[in-house]
Every structure is written in structure tokens, then in C-alpha cells.
């Protein structure tokens, strides 16, 4: 048995890192291997994450993290029953994948403007809190050449746009994603996509 | 505002015990690692111990390994040194601090106001 | 275990005068460092934190620089409150570790 990908981590800097790699072969991830994971500092505790399949040569491990803070440093080892197959260590505020925001809803009672309105996925007590920046990725559903981002580059989860701007008649949906600047972190996962329609009509003298 | 009262100090002779009290308030304690800061009288700053905010991780000083032990008490509000064996050296002031993010354990934008530890016979 | 050490361990600067302390790691930190102030008798002050981040309610004359190893605490116009001792600080690994300090006194 042998890793043909090493595993890549990345953190949510809160509780939990996501660990993915590539085996040489088919492998029932679960049934065959497991990540050790242990703090780097004195003798703290060793902590065991069973893998799941992420397709047919790929796994993905969810690790459980005693609150993550910019200190820690973990050690990584990969083990099929009692063969080591891969020995590595992971900072995980050096690889921080921020949560997906959450939430996302449109408002269109007001007349010429889309509202958009979304949740930061992370607690106010936390520093990625006042941190992230935002994409909102809007579509047309019935024509994908039609789509455009928008980038929330202030700290308010909101974005407004005319209505004008969007097709009459047409079904629009959104999706929006986070990254982090300080951190300089990847892009979040997308949000679950809303969708809503797009009711606006021009004003009979400017038609 | 963030308030943390440190209490317990005294005066112990060498191999003794005391335990330490930080009383908190003004956020949410939860959420938050906390740690032990001394300073030797006329000296800088050492760092004793952090437990972690859901107290599932402690971490301590080489100097006072199995020796102290950090704990908390989440619905007290109350953070807890236990230092056990004590040595002169370990006469300081103690401080209880909080760091300024959930997510961060070193950037102590709270500190109480300190008790002080005197080991001697 | 990495090592924090500061320089000059004292100095004595006039009111008005820009003043700077550094801070070497003995291994790449980042930019994972705070700065403190201890006035005699009293608890210490956060003032910078990420290196370069003035906390808040912390005049703007004093500031931080630096990432990696080498780091400085600069104080643009010395006032008389600014007499105390300073601490540099890293984590960005365990254990946590200070600075030796540096006592700043007023000519």
C-alpha cells in the first residue's frame, strides 16, 4: 500500500482541519487507514481521525482540533494497520481555509435594488471575524455565459445592485464564498446557491 | 468591560501548595484560552501554563511541569492554578491573562491585576 | 525552544526623541509577535500584536515593524508616560516566550 499524493491540510481556524490525499490504488479508507494527529509541545495527547473515501483512489479526514490558536503545530503520521506510510507536520494558521458563510437571502421588496444578505461563519470573538473579504458569484440560470462576481471588499455581508443591471423576467441565482487577508488564506467553500426572479421592469419612458 | 481578579497568594514554605483563583468577567469566558503569566520580583515575564477554552488542552512551562496544574471552571467563570511541590524560585506575581481573539492564546490584551507568590522558610 | 532577545537591555532618551527597541528570534516567528508596556508596579499593556498592529487605545506614536526574526518597537516622540519597560513576546509556537525587556528612562 502506497501514497501516491501526500496529504494537504487546511484549518478553519476555529476547531476543526481537513486533511485530503491520494493512495496508490483503490482503498477503503476507512476500513484500511488512520491519520494519528498530536500537538507539538511535552507529550499531549495523540488523537486518531478515520478517513473517509473521496473518490476511488482519494481520502479526506475531518480532524478535531482543541480549539486552534496561532501556537500550534501538529504531527502528522498516516498508518495502514501497523505500516507508517507517511510522516508529516501541520501548522494549521499557516493554512487556513476560512468557513463558508452561511445564510445567503435576497431581498427585492425594494423596487430597483437586489439585496443580498449573508451570515460571517465565524463568531465575533474570533479575529477571522473582522477579517474576511467576499465574492458573490451571481447567475443566470437559464444562460451561463451570463455571470459575473462581485467583490465585497468591505466588512458588512451585504451587497446591493440595481436591478437594471439583471435580466427582466429571468431566474438569477447566487452563491458567495470568504477569504480571509491578514491570513492570506484560500477562498472558503461556496454557500448553498439561493435563488429568486427577477421581477424588474424599466420605467415606460426609458424603455 | 473584561475584568480578571487574581486571588490565593501567600506566603508557603518550600515543598508546600497553594491554589490560585482568577475570577472573570466582561466576555465570554467559553470562549477563550487562558493562561498563567509570573514575574519574579525585579525580573521580565514567564510564561507558566494556558488551558485551552474548552479545557481539553493544557499546556505547561518546562519549570513547572508536574508540578502546577492549570484548570477551569467554565460555569464559574473561574480559571485555577494548583501548584504543588512549590521551590523559591517560584516567588513571583502571578497574572491571569486573556488574549485579545478566541483564536489566538499569546496576544494578551486583558491581564488581572496580580498576586503575588512568596516561597519561603 | 525559541529565544527572544532584546536590545539595548536599558536606555535613556530625552522627551521628544524617537526611540527604537528590537527583538531577535532565534528562528523565523512570522509575524507572530506582540509588544508590552510595564510602568513600575503595574500590570503589563498590550500595545502591538501581529507585529505591526497598534492595539486599541494605544497612541499612535508608538508602532511595530518587522517579520520573520528581526522586529522593532518604535516610539516617534518620547513622553514622559512612556517611561517603563518593554517586552517583546512571540507565538507563533509553544512554549510562549518574552523578551528579557527593555527599561526605557526619561534624560
Known amino acids: 500500500m502506497k501514497v501516491l499524493q501526500e496529504p494537504t491540510c487546511v484549518s478553519d481556524y476555529m476547531s476543526i482541519s481537513t486533511c485530503e490525499w491520494k493512495m496508490g490504488g483503490p482503498t477503503n479508507c476507512s476500513a484500511e487507514l488512520r491519520l494519528l494527529y498530536q500537538l507539538v509541545f511535552q507529550s499531549s495527547e495523540t488523537h486518531t481521525c478515520v478517513p473517509e473515501n473521496n473518490g476511488g483512489v482519494g481520502c479526506v479526514c475531518h480532524l478535531l482540533m482543541d480549539d486552534v490558536v496561532s501556537m500550534d503545530n501538529y504531527t502528522l503520521d498516516l498508518w495502514a494497520g501497523q505500516q507508517l506510510l507517511w510522516k508529516g507536520s501541520f501548522k494549521p494558521s499557516e493554512h487556513v481555509k476560512p468557513r463558508a458563510p452561511g445564510n445567503l437571502t435576497v431581498h427585492t421588496n425594494v423596487s430597483d435594488t437586489v439585496l443580498l444578505t449573508w451570515s460571517n461563519p465565524y463568531p465575533p470573538d474570533n479575529y477571522l471575524y473582522n477579517d474576511l473579504t467576499y465574492a458573490v458569484n451571481i447567475w443566470n440560470e437559464n444562460d451561463l455565459a451570463d455571470s459575473r462576481i462581485h467583490n465585497v471588499t468591505y466588512l458588512k455581508p451585504t451587497l446591493r445592485i440595481p436591478a437594471s443591471t439583471l435580466k427582466s423576467g429571468i431566474s438569477y441565482r447566487a452563491r458567495v464564498r470568504a477569504w480571509a487577508q491578514h491570513y492570506n488564506t484560500t477562498w472558503s467553500e461556496w454557500s448553498p446557491s439561493t435563488k429568486w426572479y427577477n421581477s424588474y421592469r424599466e420605467p415606460f419612458e426609458q424603455r | 468591560q473584561v475584568q480578571l481578579q487574581e486571588s490565593g497568594g501567600g506566603l508557603v514554605q518550600p515543598g508546600g501548595s497553594l491554589r490560585l483563583s482568577c475570577a472573570a468577567s466582561?466576555?465570554?469566558?467559553?470562549?477563550?484560552?487562558l493562561t498563567w503569566v509570573r514575574q519574579a520580583p525585579g525580573k521580565g515575564l514567564e510564561w507558566v501554563s494556558t488551558?485551552?477554552?474548552?479545557?481539553?488542552?493544557?499546556l505547561y512551562a518546562d519549570s513547572v511541569k508536574d508540578r502546577f496544574t492549570i484548570s477551569r471552571d467554565n460555569a464559574k467563570n473561574t480559571l485555577y492554578l494548583l501548584m504543588n511541590s512549590l521551590k523559591p524560585e517560584d516567588t513571583a506575581v502571578y497574572y491571569c491573562?486573556?488574549?485579545?481573539?478566541?483564536?489566538?492564546?499569546?496576544?494578551?490584551?486583558?491581564w488581572g491585576q496580580g498576586t503575588t507568590v512568596t516561597v519561603s522558610s | 525552544d525559541i529565544q527572544m532577545t532584546q536590545s539595548p537591555s536599558s536606555l535613556s532618551a530625552s522627551l521628544g526623541d524617537r526611540v527604537t527597541i528590537t527583538c531577535q528570534a532565534s528562528?523565523?516567528?512570522?509575524?507572530?509577535l506582540a509588544w508590552y508596556q510595564q510602568k513600575p508596579g503595574q500590570a503589563p499593556r498590550l500595545l502591538i500584536y501581529?507585529?505591526?498592529r497598534l492595539q486599541t487605545g494605544v497612541p499612535s506614536r508608538f508602532s511595530g515593524s518587522g517579520s520573520g526574526t528581526s522586529f522593532t518597537l518604535t516610539i516617534s516622540g518620547l513622553e514622559t508616560e512612556d517611561l517603563a519597560t518593554y517586552y517583546c513576546?512571540?507565538?507563533?509556537?509553544?512554549?510562549?516566550?518574552f523578551g528579557q525587556g527593555t527599561k526605557l528612562e526619561i534624560k
Open positions: 466582561g466576555f465570554t469566558f467559553s470562549s477563550y484560552s
Open positions: 491573562v486573556k488574549p485579545l481573539y478566541s483564536n489566538f492564546a499569546g496576544d494578551f490584551g486583558s
Open positions: 528562528q523565523s516567528i512570522s509575524s507572530y
Open positions: 513576546q512571540q507565538d507563533y509556537s509553544w512554549p510562549l516566550t
Open positions: 488551558i485551552k477554552a474548552r479545557g481539553g488542552t493544557t
Open positions: 501581529g507585529g505591526s
